[in-house]
C-alpha cells in the first residue's frame, strides 16, 4: 500500500540535491585555500541533519547550527555587498570585483544558491515531489529558515561601509518584505556600520530619473537613519557600462556618470 505523502504548494527538492551540495562543497574548498580544511562529507551530514526526518514546517535556526559551525568563514567585513531582487548583476559584479562578497560568494551561500530541499517527518526520505511554499504553506520551512539564518548573520558581520544593490525596475525598489528589507537591514550593527550605500540599478536605457528620490528609498533611508547608520544612494543608470567600467576602470568613458 503506497504511503500517504503530504502535498505541498511549492516545488520539490532539487534533483540530485545531495550530489549537488557535495560537489559544490568540493569545488568551493578547492578554489578557496582558506577553506581547504573543511570536510565536505561532514558538511553534507550537517546539512542533511538540519531537515531530514523533521516536519518541513517546523524547522528552526537551531537545526542549522551544526552546519553553521562547520561552515565558519570570515569575510572582509567592509567588502560586503547585499542585494535585493537583482541577484544576477550582484554576482556578475563580485565576479569582477573579486575583493567584494555577496552571501552567495561564501561557502554556505554557494552550497544552497538556487536549490530547494525538504524532508518528511519521521522518515529519512528527501521529498522530491513538493516542499512547503513560504506564503501558501508555512514560513518555517527548511529553505526559508536557512536563508533567514545565514542572511541575518551575514548582515551582522558587516562593518564600515556596506553596499546594497537594488532593482530600480521594480515597483518597490526597496521592499520591506524582501530578505534585505525584513532581515538584513535590521541586523546591521550600528556600532560597526557607519554607512549603508544603496546602488539603484536602472532598467530602461533612456531612464534618467533620479530613483534615489523614490518613496521606497526614502523609507529605507528613514529606517537606516533611525538605527544610527548613515545612508547614501547612487543611481546606476547603465548597468552594462557599470560592469564594463569595473572591469576596465582606466577606460576614458568611465569618468562620466554611469
Amino acid at each position: 500500500v503506497p504511503r500517504w505523502r503530504q502535498q505541498w504548494s511549492g516545488p520539490g527538492t532539487t534533483k540530485r540535491f545531495p550530489e549537488t551540495v557535495l560537489a559544490r562543497c568540493v569545488k568551493y574548498t578547492e578554489i578557496h585555500p582558506e577553506m581547504r580544511h573543511v570536510d565536505c562529507q561532514s558538511v553534507w551530514d550537517a546539512f542533511k541533519g538540519a531537515f531530514i526526518s523533521k516536519h518541513p514546517c517546523n524547522i528552526t535556526e537551531e537545526d542549522y547550527q551544526p552546519l553553521m559551525k562547520l561552515g565558519t568563514q570570515t569575510v572582509p567585513c567592509n567588502k560586503i555587498l547585499l542585494w535585493s531582487r537583482i541577484k544576477d548583476l550582484a554576482h556578475q559584479f563580485t565576479q569582477v570585483q573579486r575583493d567584494m562578497f555577496t552571501l552567495e560568494d561564501t561557502l554556505l551561500g554557494y552550497l544552497a544558491d538556487d536549490l530547494t530541499w525538504c524532508g518528511e517527518f519521521n522518515t529519512s526520505k528527501i521529498n522530491y515531489q513538493s516542499c512547503p511554499d513560504w506564503r501558501k504553506d508555512c514560513s518555517n520551512n527548511p529553505v526559508s529558515v536557512f536563508w533567514k539564518t545565514v542572511s541575518r548573520r551575514f548582515a551582522e558581520a558587516a562593518c564600515d561601509v556596506v553596499h546594497v544593490m537594488l532593482n530600480g525596475s521594480r515597483s518597490k525598489i526597496f521592499d520591506k518584505n524582501s530578505t534585505f528589507g525584513s532581515v538584513e537591514v535590521h541586523n546591521l550593527q550600528p556600532e560597526k556600520v557607519q554607512t549603508l550605500e544603496a546602488w539603484v540599478i536602472h532598467g530602461g536605457r533612456e531612464d534618467s530619473r533620479d530613483l534615489c528620490q523614490d518613496p521606497t528609498i526614502k523609507e529605507l533611508e528613514s529606517i537606516i537613519s533611525k538605527r544610527n547608520i548613515q545612508f547614501s544612494c547612487k543611481n546606476i543608470y547603465r548597468p552594462d557600462k557599470f560592469l564594463q567600467c569595473v572591469k576596465n576602470p582606466e577606460d576614458s568613458s568611465c569618468t562620466s556618470e554611469i
Epitope: 582558506e34 547550527q65 553553521m68 559551525k69 561552515g71 565558519t72 568563514q73 570570515t74 569575510v75 572582509p76 567585513c77 567592509n78 567588502k79 561564501t106 561557502l107 554556505l108 545565514v150 548573520r153 551575514f154 551582522e156 558581520a157 562593518c159 564600515d160 561601509v161 556600532e191 560597526k192 557607519q194
Partner: nanobody
C-alpha cells in the same frame, strides 16, 4: 581555519592594569571587525570594545576612558589595554572576530581577569 587565542589575563589589584592580547590565525585582523567581550559569573556575555578595518572604534559605557582597543596588523593581533581596573571588571574576557555567531564569526576560548579589592 579561523582560530583566536587570548592571553594576558590574571589577578590584579584594584587600580592596576592589564594588557590582553588576541592572536588570530586563518584570518586577517585588518580585514575584520575585532571585538572584546566579557562574561562575569551568572551574567550575560557583554561587548567591551570593538574596532573595524576602517578604525571605527566603540567602547561600552562602563569602560570608556579606562580601556583602549588596538590592532597590530603585522602580528595579526588585537589588544585591549585595561587601566584603572575595578573589582566589577572581574570576568572571563573573550576575543571575537566578525559576527557573534557562526558561520561569519569566531570566538577564542577566553582569558580570566580577576580584580581584587
Amino acid at each position: 581555519q579561523v582560530q583566536l587565542v587570548e592571553s594576558g589575563g590574571g589577578l590584579v589589584q584594584a587600580g592596576g592594569s592589564l594588557r590582553l592580547s588576541c592572536a588570530a590565525s586563518g584570518s586577517s585582523v585588518s580585514m575584520n571587525s575585532m571585538a572584546w567581550y566579557r562574561q562575569a559569573p551568572g551574567k550575560q556575555r557583554e561587548l567591551v570594545a570593538l574596532i573595524t578595518p576602517g578604525d571605527r572604534i566603540n567602547y561600552a559605557d562602563f569602560v570608556k576612558g579606562r580601556f583602549t582597543i588596538s590592532r597590530d596588523n603585522a602580528k595579526n593581533t588585537v589588544n585591549l589595554q585595561m587601566n584603572n581596573l575595578k573589582p566589577e571588571d572581574t570576568a572571563v574576557y573573550y576575543c571575537n572576530i566578525g559576527a557573534t555567531r557562526p558561520p561569519f564569526g569566531a570566538w577564542g576560548q577566553g582569558t580570566q581577569v580577576t580584580v581584587s579589592s
